[in-house]
Amino acid sequence: YKLVCYYTSWSQYREGDGSCFPDALDRFLCTHIIYSFANISNDHIDTWEWNDVTLYGMLNTLKNRNPNLKTLLSVGGWNFGSQRFSKIASNTQSRRTFIKSVPPFLRTHGFDGLDLAWLYPGRRDKQHFTTLIKEMKAEFIKEAQPGKKQLLLSAALSAGKVTIDSSYDIAKISQHLDFISIMTYDFHGAWRGTTGHHSPLFRGQEDASPDRFSNTDYAVGYMLRLGAPASKLVMGIPTFGRSFTLASSETGVGAPISGPGIPGRFTKEAGTLAYYEICDFLRGATVHRILGQQVPYATKGNQWVGYDDQESVKSKVQYLKDRQLAGAMVWALDLDDFQGSFCGQDLRFPLTNAIKDALAAT
């Protein structure tokens, strides 16, 4: 099985024990590590920040002692914006220039492939996204002709039904991608006005969301029905939780909220907590399991957080094995307890290790 793990470059800027550099990563933990994100500048792939090149070097030296590790560079992301990707993908010359710039950049900096993180193609971009993937793959094949190992091509895709329908021709893009990471998290957010888990495995009777699509099981099944081969589908598992501020004394699933949860001490983003911050939060909190959804949530005061723990990730791995998927994807290594100092287990990357162990179990 693949264990595809994202590392986010901005994690370096978190203060104190939250600061994570690539040399803190475990070279034997994941089969693939994806560095997020690269930029596109003047239609060429480029670093996002000047110090990225230093971090590329740190990441890729992990392969010195684990030659089986593969590293990919993810281009795009939320800050890049869909419009910029759209302009490049829809213009034949811009697309060509971008595609041509990728192999030398990846080779130079020691990467084994490219991950496309176009978040998200609009309805009019659907065909352009397919073309971009098809032409990128063709370039990778051509570039590998002189006996080089072919560069890998993957994409991170939304797990939301509405986005899947408008953005992706799943059957066509699957032909050209080496693997597809489906982002089976962020199904529920503060915009709903109520508490709810952002990454439930199943819908479950407790699901207060207004649709039956906002869960991992539906998203995976839908992708498979649309023509994604199970052998290329990698299922996303978050090492972060989504938090809410409760608006009343109600604390269950579907309780009214006044907004996102208070920012974490290190991640400093309202409504999001890294797993290592959740471990801190759990001291003195009340933990509940949403049985049907097979995921936990915790409450403390007026704060509510839905997250994944070692038990829930094992359930998710069992599920992906039952569906014969290619493996698991983790967002993100730097949100796990990468130092092993927060979650009281004297173990670095406890969630990712639990996923790895479950994938290896017979």
Partner: antibody, heavy 117, light 107 residues
Framework: EVQLVESGGGLVQPGGSLRLSCAAS????????MHWVRQAPGKGLEWVSA????????YYADSVKGRFTISRDNSKNTLYLQMNSLRAEDTAVYYC??????????WGQGTLVTVSS | DIQMTQSPSSLSASVGDRVTITCRAS??????LNWYQQKPGKAPKLLIY???SLQSGVPSRFSGSGSGTDFTLTISSLQPEDFATYYC?????????FGQGTKVEIK
């Protein structure tokens, strides 16, 4: 083997112009940002300017902003520094350096620019 | 701009000595601190990047440590070829700035 060879230095009068070149070899020039760093005689190092791999991002030290222009030609594996309105305090050895994330991992041998009347 | 201050500005040492040079940033620069060696008439050479990562080909007697504002370059056993001037440089934010240098001389 990475090689950076600067040229174009020399004696110039205050207010004059010079264009420095840096010929690069031994690495994929088009995939790396590049820098100019200078060193006045008997003094320390001062970063001057930087240009990203695709020329999309350019930075200058305040001391040269508006007077110096950095550029590159990826097809020729060459980095340039156009220096206008030169002053006596611009007298220095100018080094081009390969970027390793705002770390200067390879340097040329330098070219001396003397601004004097 | 971030100011980098090295100390001492010069030091005399003998072959075999353990030598320590410090560098202080005027504000936190995380691990974005690099060390260079320069010999007279030559270009600088990168020794250490990201505070503690040894550049390829650099002898292991050179090591770096520190984070935030205070950093150290250590030469565990000074060799004849190590007599030179050493500069620290921050790569945290533009303009990228250097310390004023530390000259290591033969005692």
């Amino acid at each position: 083997e990475v090689q950076l060879v600067e040229s174009g230095g020399g004696l110039v009068q205050p207010g004059g112009s010079l264009r420095l070149s840096c010929a690069a070899s031994g690495f994929t020039f088009s995939s790396y940002a590049m820098h100019w760093v200078r060193q006045a005689p008997g003094k320390g190092l001062e970063w001057v300017s930087a240009i990203s791999s695709s020329s999309g991002t350019i930075y200058y030290a305040d001391s040269v902003k508006g007077r110096f222009t950095i550029s590159r030609d990826n097809s020729k594996n060459t980095l340039y520094l156009q220096m206008n309105s030169l002053r006596a305090e611009d007298t220095a050895v100018y080094y081009c350096a390969k970027d390793f994330g705002a770390v200067f991992d390879y340097w040329g041998q330098g070219t001396l620019v003397t601004v004097s009347s | 701009d971030i100011q980098m201050t090295q100390s001492p500005s010069s030091l005399s040492a003998s072959v075999g000595d353990r030598v320590t040079i410090t560098c202080r940033a005027s504000q936190s620069i995380s691990r974005y601190l690099n060390w260079y060696q320069q010999k007279p008439g030559k270009a600088p050479k990168l020794l250490i990047y990201a505070a503690s990562s040894l550049q390829s080909g650099v002898p292991s007697r050179f090591s770096g440590s520190g984070s935030g504002t205070d950093f150290t370059l250590t030469i565990s056993s000074l060799q004849p070829e190590d007599f030179a001037t050493y500069y620290c440089q921050q790569s945290s934010s533009t303009p990228w700035t250097f310390g004023q240098g530390t000259k290591v001389e033969i005692k």
